[in-house]
């Protein structure tokens, strides 16, 4: 038991990358607990990760439903054990997040260059689809599944031994680019949604050389 | 398999104390949310509140609160639900009842057969 | 708190029969209820959770629906065995609540 009155949720923010979305939000709880709701903007509240006493709740069951969808979540406090409440009128503590759209908000990760070939003076180099949370008839998406075209990749080339950098850009996962033959090159790889106005790009993928295991190499 | 056992039948004065036990057996018992739910004579059921076991936080019905206190004892796997300053109306069977996995977390998959409370002067 | 109304709080039907019992919340409560049949004597069982799905060795004859925020219960046959009181339960909202119960006997 304890007199320390619910403090309310704040700083309530939306963490997602490919669509694995969590809410975080503050404080740290004392002699308190949350349960989140999660709902659209026409849709009913869902209750999830109930009397929990974390700061952060993973909502992607929920979100990835309709990524397409906007959603809001709120946060409520609720008195741990014989805790008094400063609610009025036995009405529970809660604060709103900010809403979120995951198919114009969500992160898009770090890619991986899965291979490369080269053949003479040409050089196909492959970015894996990542496959993502989000569900059609059973199986997961990948990506390129949930974003189309509207997702494109870029590829930084160069020649291992110099600075300067030459771009290519592709609305699949693969490029072809110009080599000079007996050069090594070193490659890396951006996601990119041109169409959006926030989180447009995704970091940089590893950095891939000409030479390592990931290559095939015929004349 | 896994069940709760609870203590037997109490009968009390009012302004008395009770402390029922429940003891899980059959999974892991840190990994369940535990409820206490009860039931006056011929009525329906009323939720008390729940425990988790993993760090003993509570969470208590408005109506309860200060007068129930719910803990935990990790070592026999055993929840206890005490309620205080007892009057008649609190003569009823009470119930723990463990909360479900993740897929039904606040659904009751599993209950004590429950112990008969009686207050009477 | 959230209400939960159920009704009717008894019914009589012959062995054979379909019975449905219905649930309705005070406000929105998404697909958050659970279904529980208690037998006299015994603690309550749960038989469907998150409005429609069956909890593992359940009879199929049992099953659940929502709209919006009306919740059903239907036995598709009634058996001998299913006389009991059946409760619906939200979870949805703290304090958690309880229908008022529905009690089935056989004709």
């Known amino acids: 038991s304890g007199t320390t009155n619910t403090v309310a949720a704040y700083n309530l923010t939306w963490k997602s990358t490919n669509f694995k979305t969590i809410l975080e939000w503050e404080p740290k709880p004392v002699n308190q607990v949350y349960t989140v709701q999660i709902s659209t903007k026409s849709g009913d509240w869902k209750s999830k990760c109930f009397y929990t006493t974390d700061t952060e709740c993973d909502l992607t069951d929920e979100i990835v439903k309709d990524v397409k969808q906007t959603y809001l979540a709120r946060v409520f406090s609720y008195p741990a054990g014989n805790v008094e409440s400063t609610g009025s009128a036995g009405e529970p503590l809660y604060e709103n997040s900010p809403e979120f759209t995951p198919y114009l908000e969500t992160n898009l990760g770090q890619p991986t260059i899965q291979s490369f070939e080269q053949v003479g003076t040409k050089v196909n180099v492959t970015v894996e689809d990542e496959r993502t949370l989000v569900r059609r008839n059973n199986t997961f998406l990948s990506l390129r599944d949930v974003f189309g075209k509207d997702l494109i990749y870029t590829l930084y080339y160069w020649k291992d031994s110099s600075t300067g950098r030459k771009t290519n850009t592709t609305h699949t996962n693969e490029f072809l680019i110009d080599v000079e033959k007996g050069v090594s090159y070193c490659f890396f790889a951006q996601a990119v949604i041109p169409s959006r106005t926030v989180n447009r790009k995704s970091t940089d993928s590893p950095v891939e050389c000409m030479g390592q295991e990931k290559g095939e190499f015929r004349e | 398999q896994v069940q709760l056992v609870q203590s037997g039948a109490e009968v009390k004065k009012p302004g008395a104390s009770v402390k029922v036990s429940c003891k899980a057996s059959?999974?892991?018992?840190?990994?369940?949310?535990m409820h206490w739910v009860r039931q006056a004579p011929g009525q329906g059921l009323e939720w008390m509140g729940i425990?988790?076991?993993?760090?003993?936080?509570?969470v208590y019905a408005q109506k309860f609160q200060g007068r129930v206190t719910m803990t935990r004892d990790t070592s026999t796997s055993t929840v206890y639900m005490e309620l205080s300053s007892l009057r008649s109306e609190d003569t009823a069977v009470y119930y723990c009842?463990?909360?479900?996995?993740?897929?039904?977390?606040?659904?009751?998959?599993?209950w004590g057969q429950g112990t008969m409370v009686t207050v009477s002067s | 708190d959230i209400q939960m109304t159920q009704s009717p709080s008894s019914l009589s039907a012959s062995v054979g029969d379909r019975v449905t019992i219905t649930c309705q919340a005070s406000?929105?409560?998404?697909?958050?209820l659970n279904w529980y049949q208690q037998k006299p004597g015994k603690a309550p069982k749960l038989l469907i959770y998150?409005?429609?799905n069956l909890e593992t060795g359940v009879p199929s004859r049992f099953s659940g629906s929502r709209s919006g925020t009306d919740f059903t219960f239907t036995i598709s046959s009634l058996q001998p065995e299913d006389i009991a009181t059946y409760y619906c339960?939200?979870?949805?909202?703290?304090?958690?609540?309880f229908g008022g119960g529905t009690k089935v006997e056989i004709k």
């Open positions: 009842a463990r909360g479900g996995s993740k897929v039904a977390a606040l659904a009751f998959d599993i």
């Open positions: 059959g999974y892991t018992f840190a990994n369940y949310y």
């Open positions: 425990i988790n076991p993993s760090g003993g936080i509570t």
């Open positions: 406000q929105d409560i998404s697909n958050s």
């Open positions: 998150d409005a429609s």
């Open positions: 339960q939200q979870y949805n909202f703290h304090p958690l609540t």
